[in-house]
C-alpha cells in the first residue's frame, strides 16, 4: 500500500469574524494507526487546536463522520472566529506509540480573518476656539483585518485634504488600528457644521462607517455689542439698550456700569437664536437723568463663556434734551434674549 499522504487542498481560507472556518484535510491511507491532530503554526511553539485522541475543544467539530474507520476526511470546523485565530493551520498524522510520533504533516492552510473596523470615534480639541483659528480633530477605529483601509474627512459634505493618517502596527498582526488627524479652519458660520470621518473597508461591503463631531462643541463665536439710547419714555427718564449679537455658546453675563460703578448684573437666559446657530440678546437700562448733575458714562460689559470681558460705552448728556443717540459695536458674538432691567437712581 502507498505511504499515507496528508492533503490540505486549500492554501488559504478567508473568514469573516464571528463565522465558522472549515479547514479541509484528507489522508490517503488507513495506516499507520494513530490520531490526527491539528495545530496552528509550526515548530516547538505550535498550538494544539484539535486532537482526535483526547482533549476538550469546544469550538472545534469534525466535519465528517468520524466514527467510521474508512473515513479519511479529517476536516474541522472552528466556530466563532476572531482575528486572534488567524494563522497557518496544519493537519498532522501521528503514529500510535509511547509517545505518539509525528508521521506526516499537511502543507498547511493559512486562515485570514476579515474583521470589521469599530465605529470611528471623532474627537476635537479640549478647549473652544474662535473663528479663523485652525483646530485639530482625531479619528480612531480599531480591530479590523485585513490591513487595507481607506479614511476620508468631510466638513459639511465637502472633503477635506489637510489630514495625516497612520495604520498600526506596520508589520503583520491579527488586527489593525487607524488613527487620523485633520486640520479644520473655523468660520463664524460653523455652529451648525459637522466634521465627519469616513472609514471604508472590505468587510463593510461598500457601506462605510462614519464618525461625527459637531463644531458647536468646538467653536466660540464672540458677541458684537451695540449700545443705543432710546427715545424718552417719561420726563427725566432715558432708556439705554445693549444689543449683544451673534454669540455662541449661550453662556454670557452682562454688567451695566454707570460712571464705572456696577449698576446691574444679569445672565443671558431668554435668548433668540439666529439661523446660523448663534444667539442674540438685548438688555435695557432705564436711567433717571434728573438724579444726575453731570453727564453719565454708561458701559455695557459682557463676559462670554469665561473669556475676558468686552465692553461698549455710551455717553449720556444730562444737560441736553434727551434724544436718541447711536453707538459703535465691540468684540464678540453669540445669543439673543430680551429682558427689562430697571437700574439707576430714583
Amino acid at each position: 500500500e502507498e505511504e499515507l499522504q496528508v492533503i490540505q487542498p486549500d492554501k488559504s481560507v478567508s473568514v469573516a469574524a464571528g463565522e465558522s472556518a472549515i479547514l479541509h484535510c484528507t489522508v490517503t491511507s488507513l495506516i499507520p494507526v494513530g490520531p490526527i491532530q491539528w495545530f496552528r503554526g509550526a515548530g516547538p511553539a505550535r498550538e494544539l487546536i484539535y486532537n482526535q485522541k483526547e482533549g476538550h475543544f469546544p469550538r472545534v467539530t469534525t466535519v465528517s463522520e468520524s466514527t467510521k474507520r474508512e473515513n479519511m476526511d479529517f476536516s474541522i470546523s472552528i466556530s466563532n472566529i476572531t482575528p486572534a485565530d488567524a494563522g497557518t493551520y496544519y493537519c498532522v498524522k501521528f503514529r500510535k506509540g509511547s509517545p505518539d510520533t509525528e508521521f506526516k504533516s499537511g502543507a498547511g492552510t493559512e486562515l485570514s480573518v476579515r474583521a470589521k473596523p469599530s465605529a470611528p470615534v471623532v474627537s476635537g480639541p479640549a478647549a473652544r476656539a474662535t473663528p479663523q483659528h485652525t483646530v485639530s480633530f482625531t479619528c480612531e477605529s480599531h480591530g479590523f483585518s485585513p490591513r487595507d483601509i481607506t479614511l476620508k474627512w468631510f466638513k459639511n459634505g465637502n472633503e477635506l485634504s489637510d489630514f495625516q493618517t497612520n495604520v498600526d502596527p506596520v508589520g503583520e498582526s491579527v488586527s489593525y488600528s487607524i488613527h487620523s488627524t485633520a486640520k479644520v479652519v473655523l468660520t463664524r458660520e460653523d455652529v451648525h457644521s459637522q466634521v465627519i470621518c469616513e472609514v471604508a473597508h472590505v468587510t463593510l461591503q461598500g457601506d462605510p462607517l462614519r464618525g461625527t463631531a459637531n463644531l458647536s462643541e468646538t467653536i466660540r463665536v464672540p458677541p458684537t455689542l451695540e449700545v443705543t439710547q432710546q427715545p424718552v419714555r417719561a420726563e427725566n427718564q432715558v432708556n439705554v439698550t445693549c444689543q449683544v449679537r451673534k454669540f455662541y455658546p449661550q453662556r454670557l453675563q452682562l454688567t451695566w456700569l454707570e460712571n464705572g460703578n456696577v449698576s446691574r448684573t444679569e445672565t443671558a437666559s431668554t435668548v433668540t437664536e439666529n439661523k446660523d446657530g448663534t444667539y442674540n440678546w438685548m438688555s435695557w437700562l432705564l436711567v433717571n437723568v434728573s438724579a444726575h448733575r453731570d453727564d453719565v458714562k454708561l458701559t455695557c460689559q459682557v463676559e462670554h463663556d469665561g473669556q475676558p470681558a468686552v465692553s461698549k460705552s455710551h455717553d449720556l448728556k444730562v444737560s441736553a434734551h434727551p434724544k436718541e443717540q447711536g453707538s459703535n459695536t465691540a468684540a464678540e458674538n453669540t445669543g439673543s434674549n430680551e429682558r427689562n432691567i430697571y437700574g439707576g437712581s430714583g
Epitope: 495506516i31 494507526v33 494513530g34 468520524s66 474507520r69 474508512e70 506509540g97 509511547s98
Partner: antibody, heavy 118, light 107 residues
Framework: EVQLVESGGGLVQPGGSLRLSCAAS????????MHWVRQAPGKGLEWVSA???????YYTGSVKGRFTISRENAKNSLYLQMNSLRAEDTAVYYC????????????WGQGTMVTVSS | DIQMTQSPSSLSASVGDRVTITCRAS??????LAWFQQKPGKAPKSLIY???SLHSGVPSKFSGSGSGTDFTLTISSLQPEDFATYYC?????????FGQGTKLEIK
C-alpha cells in the same frame, strides 16, 4: 447494526486443525484492524492475532507459525486457521473489531468454543 | 512484551459503594489503555479506551484516568449489574496484553 458472529469451533484432537470464521455486518471489515482474542476456561483474556487494513498480520508468541489470520473482503469475513492444535489452545475464541483510529477494541463477537482433547 | 498487573485480584463491595481498580504497565504505554467488563458466560464489553474515553452507551458512573504506567477504573455508585470481572488492556504495541482481571463481588 454492527455485529460480529463467530463460527467453526468444536472438539479437535491435539495436532489437528480447525478454521474459525467471523462474519461482519453493519460495517466494512477491510477498513478496520481485526483481532482474535481467546479465553481459556476459568482464565483471563489473551490476545491471539490481528490483521491490519493493509493485510499486515500479528501473532502472540505461543501461536506463531501454527495459526494464520486472514480475511475475505468479498464475504466481509475474518478467519483464523489453527494448525498443530494443543490442549492449551482450548478456549472461547472471540472476534473483535479494532477502533476507528487507535485500534481500541470496540465490538466483540459472542465467541466460539474450541476444545483440544484426545 | 508489556506486562499488565491489576489490583486487587478480587474485591467485595456493596451496592452504592464507590470502587477503584488499578492497573500498572511494565513500561510506558502513553494512554493506550482500555477497560472491559465481563459477566459469566458472556463476551467482554468495551467500557473505556485511551485511558479515560467512554465507549458509546457506557454510563458515566464509569470513569478512567492515568497515563504512562499507572491507571485506574472507578465505578462511582455500584449497582447490582456492575458485579462482574474487569480487565485492563494495553494496545500501544503488539502483542496486545491484558491484565489478569479483577473480580468484583457483592459483599
Amino acid at each position: 447494526e454492527v455485529q460480529l458472529v463467530e463460527s467453526g469451533g468444536g472438539l479437535v484432537q491435539p495436532g489437528g486443525s480447525l478454521r474459525l470464521s467471523c462474519a461482519a455486518s453493519g460495517f466494512t471489515l477491510s477498513s478496520y484492524d481485526m483481532h482474535w482474542v481467546r479465553q481459556a476456561p476459568g482464565k483471563g483474556l489473551e490476545w491471539v492475532s490481528a490483521i491490519g487494513t493493509a493485510g499486515d498480520t500479528y501473532y502472540t508468541g505461543s501461536v506463531k507459525g501454527r495459526f494464520t489470520i486472514s480475511r475475505e473482503n468479498a464475504k466481509n469475513s475474518l478467519y483464523l486457521q489453527m494448525n498443530s492444535l494443543r490442549a492449551e489452545d482450548t478456549a472461547v475464541y472471540y472476534c473483535v473489531r479494532g477502533g476507528v483510529w487507535d485500534d481500541a477494541f470496540d465490538i466483540w463477537g459472542q465467541g466460539t468454543m474450541v476444545t483440544v482433547s484426545s | 512484551d508489556i506486562q499488565m498487573t491489576q489490583s486487587p485480584s478480587s474485591l467485595s463491595a456493596s451496592v452504592g459503594d464507590r470502587v477503584t481498580i488499578t492497573c500498572r504497565a511494565s513500561q510506558d504505554i502513553n494512554n493506550y489503555l482500555a477497560w472491559f467488563q465481563q459477566k459469566p458466560g458472556k463476551a467482554p464489553k468495551s467500557l473505556i479506551y485511551t485511558a479515560s474515553s467512554l465507549h458509546s452507551g457506557v454510563p458515566s458512573k464509569f470513569s478512567g484516568s492515568g497515563s504512562g504506567t499507572d491507571f485506574t477504573l472507578t465505578i462511582s455508585s455500584l449497582q447490582p449489574e456492575d458485579f462482574a470481572t474487569y480487565y485492563c488492556q494495553q494496545y500501544v504495541s503488539y502483542p496486545y496484553t491484558f491484565g489478569q482481571g479483577t473480580k468484583l463481588e457483592i459483599k
